[in-house]
């Protein structure tokens, strides 16, 4: 049940903050989905605490999470993906706190991969491409991507570009010549499904050509 003690008695434990957050990943392992939850307070003593998900499941009423260090995790095909599930923190048979969550609204896509940048000398531009496993998925197919790049010396001066495709063109004249750049990309659900940004892809590093003094153009790498 949502709420407090089964026997109606409030105990000291219930004065603690058991706030938690979760994210789902659909078809993360073939047709298997996953759900990951963690306490928002890293100092919570998790020794006897368990997580349980009930409702909006196929063939079963509830499922228990596995504990992996500080996180709680389920991998299953049994998410109905219609309606809200009841996710609860339990100690023994007693629930300390519960949240009703629609798993389609807390989707965290898998990180993009195979990020690369190719310089086109004739066009004076850089073609950025990357891949995403979501192109092959049945559910979370439509994503918004956030490409972020910066000059390596500019610690926090990231430029962000949002796009729905997996290809982006950066004009050479918009970048500093003879500079080392770092670029990375992440994704978020963009149609029907809602949720969170994925982890960033591994960064890719590229150098811009120097300016050719006679023509004012950059030299290719």
């Amino acid at each position: 049940e949502s709420g407090y003690a089964q026997n109606g008695d409030l105990e000291d434990a219930e004065l603690d903050d058991y706030s938690f957050s979760c994210y789902s990943q659909l078809e993360v392992n073939g047709s298997q989905h996953s759900l990951t939850c963690a306490f928002e307070d890293p100092d919570v003593n998790i020794t006897n605490l368990e997580f349980e998900i009930c409702g909006a499941l196929v063939e079963v009423k509830c499922l228990n999470f596995r504990k992996l260090q500080e996180i709680y995790f389920i991998e299953t095909k049994k998410f109905l993906l219609i309606g809200k599930s009841n996710i609860c923190v339990k100690v023994g048979e007693k629930s300390l706190t519960c949240k009703k969550i629609d798993l389609t609204t807390i989707v965290k896509p898998e990180a993009p991969f195979d990020l690369s940048v190719v310089y086109r000398e004739g066009a004076n531009d850089f073609v950025v491409t990357f891949n995403t496993s979501h192109l092959q998925k049945k559910y979370v197919k439509v994503l918004m991507h956030d490409v972020a790049y910066r000059q390596e010396k500019d610690e926090n001066k990231w430029t962000h570009v949002n796009l729905s495709s997996t290809k982006l063109t950066l004009l050479q004249r918009k970048l500093q010549p003879a500079a080392m750049y770092e670029i990375k990309v992440r994704s978020i659900p963009d149609h029907y499904f809602k949720g969170f940004w994925s982890e960033w892809s591994p960064s890719y590093y590229f150098r811009t050509p120097e300016i050719n003094n006679s023509s004012g153009e950059m030299d290719p790498i």
Partner: antibody, heavy 122, light 106 residues
Framework: QVQLQQPGAELVMPGASVKLSCKAS????????MHWVKQRPGEGLEWIGE????????NDNQKFKGKATLTVDKSSSTAYMQLSSLTSEDSAVYYC???????????????WGQGTSVTVSS | DIQMTQSPSSLSASLGGKVTITCKAS??????IAWYQHKPGKGPRLLIH???TLQPGIPSRFSGSGSGRDYSFSISNLEPVDIATYYC????????FGAGTKLELK
């Protein structure tokens, strides 16, 4: 001990609405969902829906969509069911019933109120 | 929706005897069945849940069994206080009651 108190009877006009109450005592109100069940004279029991008093989340029998609205008042540990656009078909005894302790949806009930007899008549 | 077919609809039995009521679900309900005793003017009383789990305070004369779609409920050593209407309830998906069995004394 667990008690669910319901008024004995309500007489209402056709087309009107009625709000039935169910006052809970003897346990932590927000820890247990509350069900509502209908029984027409000489007939069996029919599930209407359930509500989680901790956050007012409801699961309903589609048959009663638009007819029954479930709410709670946590401060008074009272569950309510509003029945609207009443007809003679709504004349019945309505029970509230506390659900067995479980986090899952759709679970059996343990303690029941005595029921409120609703008569729809002009 | 899951339908519950309860039989018989009425039953006459002798004191000290044994009665059995059955409920058949329209699909597998995974043992999520409860049994209630209902007397006029009162709220129903939970006797058994999850097929065979006896509620605290309920005498062991009451028992339940079954799996899949087929379930049964028995009262042995029948006493006068057992005269009532009995209902099964499936709670696997939504909640559906059987039509009831009225138990009378012979």
């Amino acid at each position: 001990q667990v008690q669910l108190q319901q008024p004995g009877a309500e007489l209402v006009m056709p087309g009107a609405s009625v709000k039935l109450s169910c006052k809970a005592s003897g346990y932590t109100f927000t820890s247990y969902w509350m069900h509502w069940v209908k029984q027409r004279p000489g007939e069996g029991l029919e599930w209407i829906g359930e509500i989680d008093p901790s956050d007012s989340y409801t699961n309903d029998n589609q048959k009663f969509k638009g007819k029954a609205t479930l709410t709670v008042d946590k401060s008074s540990s009272t569950a309510y069911m509003q029945l609207s656009s009443l007809t003679s078909e709504d004349s019945a005894v309505y029970y509230c019933a506390r659900r067995l302790y479980s986090n899952s949806y759709y679970y059996a009930m343990d303690y029941w109120g005595q029921g409120t007899s609703v008569t729809v008549s002009s | 929706d899951i339908q519950m077919t309860q039989s018989p609809s009425s039953l006459s039995a002798s004191l000290g005897g044994k009665v059995t009521i059955t409920c058949k679900a329209s699909q597998d309900i995974k043992k999520y069945i409860a049994w209630y005793q209902h007397k006029p003017g009162k709220g129903p009383r939970l006797l058994i849940h999850y097929t065979s789990t006896l509620q605290p305070g309920i005498p062991s004369r009451f028992s339940g069994s079954g799996s899949g779609r087929d379930y049964s409920f028995s009262i042995s050593n029948l006493e006068p206080v057992d005269i009532a209407t009995y209902y099964c309830l499936q709670y696997d998906n939504l909640l559906t009651f059987g039509a009831g069995t009225k138990l009378e004394l012979k």
